[in-house]
């Protein structure tokens, strides 16, 4: 029989009276072979990190600040809980640290030095550690001590809780920095008011403080964000302006053998059985012998984190950046005008090659990582072990809601103005045999599919979002008798054609050999009845022109396409036969790399790009016969995106609204994961 | 296809040098990027030094200042001289002429180079 008893550890004499009494009353109301509770007392948060670690434990609810140490070495430990605060239908299970300031001040975030700073209390989170964090490598040096750092930074501040004494400067507008709410500048709202006040010049706060100290919208409109891309924003913009987004309390286990499903079924019943009045004998949110004693008695329930989500992704970039900064203290020696190495990121091994083959002969300019999947790479992007990679339309949609913007397009028209012209997109065709004469688009059930791979555009996420519209379910393993899907689960029909050994089936990556356009069309070629791809695969794969054995003989007549009315027509007419318009392929990144991304691989491809005549003894950034690698072989420049620098802008309206059409669907664990973040 | 041997390896003591060799033969007319891998037991294949047809030259963070890659183009050879070999250093070393390898997973025999007292 599995032990279903989730070990809580409890940090005081009080917290463990209160799991006793938790064990206990959920004795009284779960089946016997249901999760049960133990109790495991320890002297400090750290000590219970460590106990859990050791399999000691099993759980322990803590703030950010101790997440991150939970998921340092050697603890590697995992959210995998949060509590949420107001309602179960708006629930609120992060807050966001800001930076306010009044509106007609006319500074950005790197023009703060000089200017005076309200704080609400030195080592909280919003006030002190976030932003300073994010400033540390702007301190004047020696950073340690860091008060002093921080008050030669500023001219002046209050720092409630900082020592008066020895850092004057940090107790100016506070006279005697008091730590409790005698100091009227101490906290959230006594931050606010040194604002306010005209004390100082800018407040560190989190974004609910303004809301609750100024309920008139006219009297808000007289104060803005600082963004950290040296921009402002409006205060109700909170989510796209902030310092960071930090989760407010959180259950972590350990990442392997965690019992992390069991940890969720024992919180969702005592939720439903102790939650916010639901019992008078016990109540899981109060503490009548103390103050948020195992969970903090303002929540108001649990949520389940999403089980792709590890503590960086759950920090969030911005937040492991700055804990990290005060934590270890290292700032980079180049000047921070100057632009870092790009870290390209590569899917598996082939890819891999060719980034190695263009770091070389970009001169350090270009570096590589590699991951095996593209929502991989999407997360090596997020928490900053990569910095850029060029996605397919599908992916460019999972990145933007990861918090990631395109930063330039695949042009794939030759014109004279190449990099400041964005083109309007490619279309998304389905592909048969000629000699397949009585196939149509309305008769493809249980017909055998080829796809690029699950959640691109046109080889998955335009036919399927179709198809949807049609079956009303998201069944398409059953729709299709077998095909070959990158990315589907494995046991799954749409794995079947796959021609990947041993793993590597159905991988979404080279590995697989129906994976890709190209891949794709193969299937076609050797085993299936349609194809799912783009308008040019057909051409740039037959007369020739793939020198493949699979391919070399192939002829562009042999091949129709399916129109959505039924009808068929020659490959060349895709303009009057396709199933959608697709955007380009587009690099992404992360909004604070925007720039360098930007400048340098402009540089990159005037070297490396279109203009480069002879492949054959030179490095080529656009080609790999075929195969795609890093960019799409028929891309002819990176262009400028201009306006069009969000996800929303890039993709169309269209098409975000077809592919959120297609989120119930979804087998993303990253697009579930960055909509808990961001729902 | 392009055919690379490479040679050179051998047993050496921490501190001391090696040279390895790789000669290339096949249709070297497209030969452009070279560069050195090296794969140590249970680890990945990682890229060591790099060296384009016009002799510009990038080495892996790890290597700098100790490997020196060069290359012969009248003699379709490339080198590395290897100074100051630490036990991390011990590998496998391939040498690999791009256009060929990330298209058809071409790689040559390697040669063991093994560093201990």
């Known amino acids: 029989v599995p032990d279903k008893t989730v070990r809580w550890c409890a940090v005081s004499e009080h917290e463990a009276t209160k799991c006793q009494s938790f064990r206990d009353h959920m004795k009284s109301v779960i089946p016997s072979d249901g999760p049960s509770v133990a109790c495991v007392k320890k002297a400090s948060y750290l000590d219970c990190i460590r106990a859990i670690a050791a399999n000691e434990a099993d759980a322990v609810t803590l703030d950010a600040g101790l997440v991150y140490d939970a998921y340092l070495a050697p603890n590697n430990l995992k959210p995998v809980v949060a509590e949420f605060y107001g309602s179960k239908e708006d629930p609120q299970t992060f807050y966001y640290a800001v930076a306010v300031v009044k509106k007609d001040s006319g500074f950005q975030m790197n023009q703060l030095r000089g200017k005076k700073s309200c704080h609400t209390g030195l080592g909280r989170s919003a006030g002190w550690n976030i932003p300073i964090g994010l400033l540390y490598c702007d301190l004047p040096e020696p950073r340690k001590p860091l008060e002093k750092a921080v008050a030669n930074f500023f001219s002046g501040s209050c720092a409630p809780c900082a020592d008066g004494t020895d850092f004057p400067q940090l107790c100016q507008l506070c006279p005697g920095c008091g730590c409790s709410t005698l100091n009227q500048y101490f906290g959230y709202s006594g931050a606010f008011k040194c604002l306010k006040d005209g004390a100082g010049d800018v407040a560190f706060v989190k974004h609910s403080t303004i809301f609750e100290n100024l309920a008139n919208k006219a009297d808000r409109d007289q104060y803005e964000l600082l963004c950290l891309d040296n921009t402002r924003k409006p205060v109700d913009e909170y989510k796209d302006c902030h310092l960071a987004q930090v989760p407010s309390h959180t259950v972590v286990a350990r990442s392997m053998g965690g019992k992390e499903d069991l940890i969720w079924e024992l919180l969702n019943q005592a939720q439903e059985h102790f939650g916010k009045d639901k019992s008078k004998e016990f109540q899981l949110f109060s503490s009548p012998h103390g103050k948020d004693l195992l969970f903090k008695d303002s929540a108001h329930g649990f949520l389940k984190v999403p089980p792709r989500m590890d503590a960086k992704m759950y920090l969030g970039y911005e937040y492991v950046t700055a804990i990290r900064n005060l934590r270890e203290g290292t700032c980079p020696e180049a000047p921070t005008d100057e632009c870092k190495p790009v870290k390209w990121c590569a899917l598996s091994h082939h890819e891999r090659l060719k980034c190695d083959e263009w770091s070389v002969n970009s001169v350090g300019k270009i570096e590589c990582v590699s991951a095996e999947t593209t929502e991989d790479c999407i997360a090596k992007i997020m928490n900053g072990e990569a910095d850029a990679m060029s996605l397919d339309g599908g992916f460019v949609y999972i990145a933007g809601k990861c918090g990631l913007v395109p930063v330039l397009a695949e042009n794939y028209n030759k014109s004279d103005n190449c990099e400041d012209t964005p083109e309007a997109g490619y279309f998304a065709i389905a592909v048969v045999k000629k000699s397949a004469s009585d196939l149509t688009w309305d008769n493809l059930k249980g017909k055998k599919s080829c796809h690029t791979a699950v959640g691109r555009t046109a080889g998955w996420n335009i036919p399927m979002g179709l198809l949807y519209n049609k079956i009303n379910h998201c069944r398409f393993d059953e729709f299709f008798s077998e095909g070959c899907a990158p990315g589907s689960k494995k046991d799954s029909s749409l794995c079947k054609l796959c021609m990947g050994s041993g793993l590597n089936l159905c991988e979404p990556n080279n590995k697989e050999g129906y994976y890709g356009y190209t891949g794709a069309f193969r299937c076609l070629v050797e085993k299936g009845d349609v194809a799912f791809v783009k308008h040019q695969t057909v051409p740039q794969n037959t007369g020739g022109k793939n020198p493949d054995p699979w391919a070399k003989n192939l002829n562009e007549k042999d091949y129709e396409l399916l129109c959505l009315d039924g009808t068929r027509k020659p490959v060349e007419e895709y303009a009057n036969c396709h199933l959608a318009r697709a955007p380009n392929h587009a690099v992404v990144t992360r909004k604070d790399k925007e720039a360098c991304v930007h400048k340098i691989l402009r540089q990159q491809q005037h070297l490396f790009g279109s203009n480069v005549t002879d492949c054959s003894g030179n490095f080529c950034l656009f080609r790999s016969e075929t195969k795609d690698l890093l960019f799409r072989d028929d891309t002819v420049c990176l262009a400028k995106l201009h306006d069009r620098n969000t996800y929303e802008k890039y993709l169309g309206e269209e098409y975000v609204k077809a592919v959120g059409n297609l989120r119930k669907c979804s087998t993303s664990s990253l697009l579930e994961a960055c909509t808990f973040r961001r729902p | 296809q392009v055919q690379l041997v490479e040679s050179g390896g051998g047993l050496v003591q921490p501190g001391g040098s090696l040279r390895l060799s790789c000669a290339a033969s096949g249709s070297i007319f497209s030969i452009n990027t070279m560069a050195w891998y090296r794969q140590a037991p249970g680890k990945q294949r990682e890229l060591v030094a790099g060296?384009?047809?016009?002799?510009?030259?990038t080495y892996a963070g790890s290597v700098k200042g100790r490997f020196t890659i060069s290359r012969d183009n009248a003699k379709n050879t490339v080198y590395l001289q290897m100074n100051s070999l630490k036990p991390e250093d011990t590998a496998v070393y391939y040498c690999?002429?791009?256009?060929?390898?990330?298209?058809?997973?071409?790689w040559g025999q390697g040669t063991q180079v093994t560093v201990s007292s």
């Open positions: 690999t002429d791009y256009s060929s390898s990330y298209y058809q997973d071409y």
């Open positions: 060296i384009t047809r016009s002799g510009t030259t």
